[in-house]
């Protein structure tokens, strides 16, 4: 009996430019003899329904149809037919199929590969054309993929134990596609600093599929107006 097992859940997520290993494990009732077996990896793009050969291994012959693609012969001996793809790109997302032949038996498995790019975030203060005591803070998120992103603004005053989401005077622009396929977006917060308590911390919070925890940039209103800080992971409400 020959069986192939892919990533649990049928989906693998990998960061852009990563050296990804797409898992494929072979289960066979007898010890594997790699000289008398074959492995072929196929890829089907998200946009075209056509399957393309990525890599093949037969006995003493192996060929990479995608530069750098490799299945380790040493690992194959112990049933690991995982495909390694260095420097994965956005356009390489899609369905990957691992086909194993141990004559006369054949088994296969498929997995969806999602390629994500994490946003970079920065905070800018724009006072051009603003009235006295009125400031516009811009939170720029760039280089992310996929397009879906959630940007919110939060504030925390000195006295209260938790932050609160700000919904008024927030404008988030449209996402803009970059040449490399990633996206950028800017969210703006308009503040009347004369109406806010010194010591209040404002924070731009970016949530995206590529992030385990939100990305944060914050600034604190001080008696002498404000101090901007570029933070991703610090004691953000200090």
């Amino acid at each position: 009996d020959l069986k192939v097992e892919m990533m649990a859940g049928g989906t693998q997520i990998t960061p852009l430019n990563d050296n990804v290993t797409i898992f494929c494990n072979i289960f066979y009732s007898q010890p594997l003899n790699i000289t008398s077996m074959g492995i072929t990896w196929f890829w089907k793009s998200l946009t075209f329904d056509k399957e393309v050969k990525v890599f093949e291994f037969f006995g003493d012959h192996q060929e990479a149809f995608r530069p750098g693609a490799i299945v380790s012969p040493w690992r194959l001996k112990s049933g690991d037919a995982s495909l390694r793809l260095p420097g994965i790109q956005l356009e390489e997302a899609g369905e990957y199929r691992c086909e194993v032949v141990v004559t006369p038996l054949k088994a296969q498995g498929t997995v969806q590969l999602e390629v994500v790019a994490s946003p970079a975030s920065r905070l800018l203060l724009d006072q051009v054309g603003m009235k006295e005591n009125e400031d516009k803070y811009m939170c720029e998120s760039s280089g992310f993929y996929p397009e879906a992103i959630n940007i919110t603004w939060e504030k925390q005053t000195q006295k209260f134990p938790h932050p609160i989401e700000i919904s008024e005077d927030v404008i988030t622009g449209p996402t803009i596609k970059n040449m490399d396929g990633t996206f950028n977006v800017t969210s703006c917060l308009k503040l009347n600093s004369s109406q806010e308590d010194p010591g209040t911390v404002y924070q731009c919070v970016v949530r995206h599929a590529s992030l385990h925890t939100p990305l944060r940039s914050n600034f604190t209103l001080t008696a002498a107006r404000h101090s901007l800080s570029e933070t991703e992971k610090t004691d953000n409400f200090s």
């Epitope: 209260f160 134990p161 609160i164 989401e165 939100p214 004691d235």
Partner: antibody, heavy 117, light 107 residues
Framework: QVQLVQSGAEVKKPGASVKVSCKAS????????MNWMRQAPGQGLEWMGG????????DYNEKFKGRVTMTVDTSTSTVYMELSSLRSEDTAVYYC??????????WGQGTLVTVSS | DIQMTQSPSSLSASVGDRVTITCKAS??????VAWYQQKPGKAPKSLIY???NRYDGVPSRFSGSGSGTDFTLTISSLQPEDFTTYYC?????????FGAGTKLEIK
């Protein structure tokens, strides 16, 4: 990292006073507000009041006004909560708490005050 | 003072169950509601702020919703470590007030 370390358990007689301390470390002490909460055995949580750590502002729950005093010693980064005219229903665990960061607010480990004759 | 009425006061469930705890404020508190988990002998730990935002490190099975006067905490698939007590808190104004708590017990 931020730490709030409270003083040890106390046993008091009715009518006496108790002073619980909370020593803070790991952050700029004076730029924060510290709240005090309490929790009677098997009961819910109750806010008692708070103090700005520069020592220039306090806010007390009306229920405790006249009995509670919160003070700060900035030289040792310590906050104190004193409760007077103790009665049996003041038996509780007392907590100091500080506004949080992205992992939530910070709490001391709690101080059990037992009021018993 | 703003009263926070939490229900149920206790709840029996099994590992893997989906459970919902509700909290009703006596007046409009916007989204200024937090949820805490408290294990016996320990200080409360905050899970949710601003009604629906999870603090970092809090498992995704915990979610909050609501605004105005009605709020819920949902645990989508109970784990053994979730069987403890939960409190809601309003922080729109002083005095800060809490719900009376919901004790989650293993069925």
């Amino acid at each position: 990292q931020v730490q709030l370390v409270q003083s040890g358990a106390e046993v008091k007689k009715p009518g006496a006073s108790v002073k619980v301390s909370c020593k803070a470390s790991g952050y700029t002490f004076t730029s924060y507000w510290m709240n005090w909460m309490r929790q009677a055995p098997g009961q819910g949580l109750e806010w008692m009041g708070g103090i700005y750590l520069s020592g220039d502002s306090t806010d007390y729950n009306e229920k405790f006004k006249g009995r509670v005093t919160m003070t700060v010693d900035t030289s040792t980064s310590t906050v104190y909560m004193e409760l007077s005219s103790l009665r049996s229903e003041d038996t509780a665990v007392y907590y100091c708490t500080r506004r949080g960061d992205y992992f939530g607010d910070f709490w001391g480990q709690g101080t059990l005050v037992t009021v018993s004759s | 003072d703003i009263q926070m009425t939490q229900s149920p006061s206790s709840l029996s469930a099994s590992v893997g169950d989906r459970v919902t705890i509700t909290c009703k404020a006596s007046q409009n508190v916007g989204k200024y509601v937090a949820w805490y988990q408290q294990k016996p002998g320990k200080a409360p730990k905050s899970l949710i702020y601003s009604a629906s935002n999870r603090y970092d490190g809090v498992p995704s099975r915990f979610s909050g919703s609501g605004s105005g006067t009605d709020f819920t905490l949902t645990i989508s698939s109970l784990q053994p470590e979730d069987f403890t007590t939960y409190y809601c808190q309003q922080y729109i104004s002083y005095p800060l007030t809490f719900g009376a708590g919901t004790k989650l017990e293993i069925k």
